[in-house]
Amino acid sequence: KKVVLGKKGDTVELTCTASQKKSIQFHWKNSNQIKILGNQGSFLTKGPSKLNDRADSRRSLWDQGNFPLIIKNLKIEDSDTYICEVEDQKEEVQLLVFGLTANSDTHLLQGQSLTLTLESPPGSSPSVQCRSPRGKNIQGGKTLSVSQLELQDSGTWTCTVLQNQKKVEFKIDIVVLAFQKASSIVYKKEGEQVEFSFPLAFTVEKLTGSGELWWQAERASSSKSWITFDLKNKEVSVKRVTQDPKLQMGKKLPLHLTLPQALPQYAGSGNLTLALEAKTGKLHQEVNLVVMRATQLQKNLTCEVWGPTSPKLMLSLKLENKEAKVSKREKAVWVLNPEAGMWQCLLSDSGQVLLESNIKVLPTWSTPVQP
């Protein structure tokens, strides 16, 4: 007996071939001997089966002695043995229909779990193997679970169902809802405008929810809500914003915040959360602000940085086109009695400059002593 695997909702074509290459009488029946379809001359006739409106054939093949049974919009309960009667012969085909579905929405938040459930006909014992977009394989029986979804799990999951040495492939599109970056860092000189961007790693037609940016300034003892906003069909509207700092927010995606100027008291780290409609849990993105200030006070040239810097970052003071006068893995460096010229304060990571501030030191003219 030939075995054919089908997918729920799909179309399957069961073949039946006569030895004579001409149109002759044929009938397709199910295991209960109920007629599904057949022919009367060159015309298709249908029987009283439950497949009536979903069964078809290809009349253009009958002249070659081919009498296929096409079943549209397959259901699990269509799994059965189908019998083609032609030329006093009986051809039996066992059809097994499987369905694979994500038990929840296919749009899941980063860190959530994905469960895939296999629907199969009674008496079958299939095995399932799924491959994630990043190439990770998972195996199972009737259910497969993946915990702690990551951004790289977004995309098409390819699942293969194996039964009687035959296989059928399912493709399920999974969207992991997350920000493109888990964390970002912005380096700015004091007084510069700061742009924070929070691009999403997914696109959906309608996006509705609400969000908030909490900020923990380095100098402050507790965190503070800087802004709250609503998102309706990808349109952003601000609900509440602090007076200091007075943040501005873009009206369209990607989420975009502007801080009019970088000041040492704002240096620190923030957490933007986004709660999406009909989703439990929130999306998070951490954002950090590092502010640099270079000052000259009497005979002391100082360079300072505020905010979350890594211990391996180097802070240097150097006269333009010369070697660094001072270079330390600290948040403040200074030079006493600096020479006249353009001084550069540099914050660098393994030789790569992250932030630079220039300050001009004027020559000091010593007043001649009167005789």
Partner: antibody, heavy 120, light 107 residues
Framework: EVILVQSGGALVEPGGSLKLSCSAS????????MSWVRQTPEKRLEWVAA????????YYPDSVKGRFTISRDNAKNTLYLQMNSLRSEDTAIYYC?????????????WGQGTTLTVSS | DIQMTQSPSSLSASLGGKVTIACKAS??????IAWYQHKPGKGPRLLIH???TLQPGIPSRFSGSGSGRDYSFSISNLEPEDIATYYC?????????FGGGTKLEIK
């Protein structure tokens, strides 16, 4: 002899509507699935609608879904195509075509074609 | 939808000669391909269906072959009346799609 005679082509403004007809003779009309196919000015052939022998099923490509409606009157041996919300890209020669038999069969006989021009 | 890529878009051959047209499907179409001849002012004419089955009344100079995604159509011993545009059609599923057409000219 299978004969399919078409009518209804016209010049229509964008957003307008038009109904094409195809009168069949020389075969038992009610035993065959029917279709409409168009040839664009670039000479590409595009299938635009299909209907099963007793109107049980109708099929459309995404490009016309919701705007075009195929129907048939087996008593009058006539096939129709109602076209609404017409766009300039619907400009084409429209052919009615008989399917070899059922929904899954290729087209074996075609009408002579009727021209639709969508322009302001 | 299944895409059908037909090549070449035009070709020129001598009377008595042979031409071959190819159609490549974007997925396996299980031999459900038909070939049509189309002349200006007329409806297309079915020549071959199910890859290689010749329609009644079509001369055996016309032939078709292929499987899976790749199919070809040939005309041998070219005659003046073969000047036309030829199209392939996939009918594997209910969303039928045509190839872009090949315009045949005689040298």
């Amino acid at each position: 002899e299978v004969i399919l005679v078409q009518s209804g082509g016209a010049l229509v403004e964008p957003g307008g509507s038009l109904k094409l007809s195809c009168s069949a003779s020389g075969f038992t009309f009610s035993n065959y699935a029917m279709s409409w196919v168009r040839q664009t000015p670039e000479k590409r052939l595009e299938w635009v609608a299909a209907i099963s022998d007793h109107s049980t099923n109708t099929y459309y490509p995404d490009s016309v879904k919701g705007r075009f409606t195929i129907s048939r009157d087996n008593a009058k041996n006539t096939l129709y195509l109602q076209m609404n919300s017409l766009r300039s890209e619907d400009t084409a020669i429209y052919y009615c075509a008989r399917k070899y038999g059922g929904d899954y069969d290729p087209f074996d006989y075609w009408g002579q074609g009727t021209t639709l021009t969508v322009s302001s | 939808d299944i895409q059908m890529t037909q090549s070449p878009s035009s070709l020129s051959a001598s009377l008595g000669g042979k031409v071959t047209i190819a159609c490549k499907a974007s997925q396996d179409i299980n031999n459900y391909i038909a070939w049509y001849q189309h002349k200006p002012g007329k409806g297309p004419r079915l020549l071959i269906h199910y890859t290689s089955t010749l329609q009644p009344g079509i001369p055996s100079r016309f032939s078709g072959s292929g499987s899976g995604r790749d199919y070809s159509f040939s005309i041998s011993n070219l005659e003046p009346e073969d000047i036309a545009t030829y199209y392939c059609l996939q009918y594997d599923n209910l969303l039928f799609t045509f190839g872009g057409g090949t315009k045949l000219e005689i040298k």
